[in-house]
């Protein structure tokens, strides 16, 4: 139950953080023009990953694409990467954490097979919200250098007779989207991967071997004993040995690098 | 079709106070910003006060800067400037203006209404 | 806060000929966001309060004829009338829509030769 129980808050966690992603990567405001100490002019300057906005006093707001490839920073660029391959690694993330989840059946899907998909789906949340979170962070930095060099620049010498006005960019809601998508969907990652322990088979069974003393028949039985995974006991999964004569392959299980994660 | 009356000027001593009104009709008043710019008799045009629709911007002239208010009410589709502390170099017509919707234009006028500081 | 400065002070032209009256702003108006320039030019008639003919430095407001354009960028601007009619006889103004406090230039007063 509480294996499932993580899953399940893993799989909604990550989906949150993922949309917060997507919704991160898509707005206009990741970095906003800086009303501190600054001229206070008639027009508020924003701009996204993929467009600058400008918004008059009278609300009338336009928006210009970067239309140019290779004119933009290697920088922008480079947080336009990681933020679609978090969105595209999330996404598949998603995708397999739907079949991987225990609520739902899919034909005669073996619970390796799920752990494995959980594994595999919260290692995806986890590279997914690090790539968020480096790539809002990469832009912070470069927000944060622009933002000095233009401070610098407004208290120098112009150089000539006419002033220009120096906008200065802030952090934008973006950034703190981003941040906040990011770290959702690395905990649910992390937690999709705890999940994955206890979906995993946890026993290494071996075949009882009978040890006949004279006089009386005693079975022994090794390996029926392991320590709790910390997520209460899943009687559904384990195999709890209850001295019942069974089949070769009912017993016969294999160990599975699940156990060790 | 877009109406602006100013109203309120008048004949007052150096010192005193004033309070002009703008009543507004043929646009939603709310939607947009005001301004308020005044002209002395022969001379340039100069402006005194902006106030953005929902009054969170509001900004003046340095001329006028801790003189003059400038408030709205949106309910009676009406603008305001109180003035106070009245000198002879603010003798001049009073225009009440829109803000327009493109490049932080000006674009409907009233008529104006005469203020004379005189003792 | 921002100077305008227009040039001439005043400026008599023959009917249908072409007058030119010039804007200077003592900081730039243009704005890289938009690519606009925020520069504004109105007409006053003896008589009249003032009405908007160009907004954006060369965007012509509704109604206004042809004949009216604005040219420039960054802290020159021109305004051109075309071919001048007897109705244009005004005093032109242009004005930062940019920085506050908004400022108005000194006026061009256009006159017929």
């Known amino acids: 139950m509480a294996v499932t129980a993580c899953q399940g808050l893993g799989f909604v966690v990550s989906l949150i953080g993922i949309a917060g992603i997507i919704a991160a990567t898509c707005m206009d405001q990741w970095s906003t023009q800086d009303l501190y100490n600054n001229p206070v002019t008639a027009v508020f300057n924003y701009q996204g990953l993929w467009r600058s906005c400008v918004r008059e006093s009278s609300g009338f707001t336009e928006c210009r694409g970067y239309f140019t490839l290779l004119g933009l920073p290697a920088m922008l660029q480079a947080v336009r990467a990681l933020m679609i391959v978090g969105i595209v690694l999330g996404a598949i993330g998603l995708l397999v954490s739907i079949f991987a989840l225990k609520c739902i059946r899919i034909g005669s899907m073996e619970d390796s097979a799920k752990a494995n998909m959980t594994l595999t789906s919260g290692i995806m949340f986890i590279v997914s919200g690090l790539c968020a979170i480096a790539g809002v962070s990469v832009f912070a930095n470069m927000l944060v250098t622009n933002f000095w060099m233009s401070t610098a620049n407004m208290y120098t010498g112009m150089g000539g007779m006419v002033q220009t006005v120096q906008t200065r960019y802030t952090f934008g809601a973006a950034l703190f989207v981003g941040w906040v998508a990011g770290g959702l969907t690395l905990i649910g990652g992390v937690m999709m991967c705890i999940a994955c322990r206890g979906l995993a088979p946890e026993e290494t069974n071996y075949k009882a071997v009978s040890y006949h003393a004279s006089g009386h028949s005693v079975a022994y039985k090794p390996g029926g004993f392991k320590a709790s995974t910390g997520f209460g006991s899943n009687t559904k999964n384990k195999k709890i040995y209850d001295g019942g004569a069974r089949t070769e392959d009912e017993v016969q299980s294999y160990p599975s690098k699940h156990d060790y994660v | 079709e877009v109406q602006l009356v100013e109203s309120g000027g008048g004949l007052v001593q150096p010192g005193g106070s004033l309070r002009l009104s703008c009543a507004v009709s043929?646009?939603?008043?709310?939607?947009?910003?005001m301004h308020w710019v005044r002209q002395a008799p022969g001379k340039g045009l100069e402006w005194v006060a902006y106030i953005s629709s929902g009054t969170t911007n509001i900004y003046y002239a340095d001329s006028v800067k801790g003189r003059f208010t400038v408030s709205r009410d949106n309910a009676k589709n009406s603008l305001y400037l109180q003035m106070n502390s009245l000198r002879a170099e603010d003798t001049a017509v009073y225009y009440c203006v829109r803000s327009g919707y493109y490049g932080n234009s000006l674009d409907y006028w009233g008529q104006g209404t005469l203020v004379t500081v005189s003792s | 806060d921002i100077v305008m400065t227009q040039s001439p002070d005043s400026l008599a032209v023959s009917l249908g000929e072409r007058a030119t009256i010039n804007c200077k702003s003592s900081q730039s108006l243009f704005n890289s966001g938009n690519q606009r320039n925020y520069l504004t030019w109105y007409q006053q008639k003896p008589g009249q309060p003032p009405k908007l003919l160009i907004y954006w430095a060369s965007t012509r407001e509704s109604g206004v004829p042809d004949r009216f354009s604005g040219s420039g960028s960054g802290t020159d601007f021109t305004l051109t009338i075309s071919s001048l009619q007897a109705e244009d006889v005004a005093v032109y103004y242009c004005q930062n829509v940019y920085i506050y406090p908004l400022t108005f230039g000194q006026g061009t007063k256009l006159e017929i030769k």
């Open positions: 043929g646009f939603t008043f709310s939607s947009f910003g």
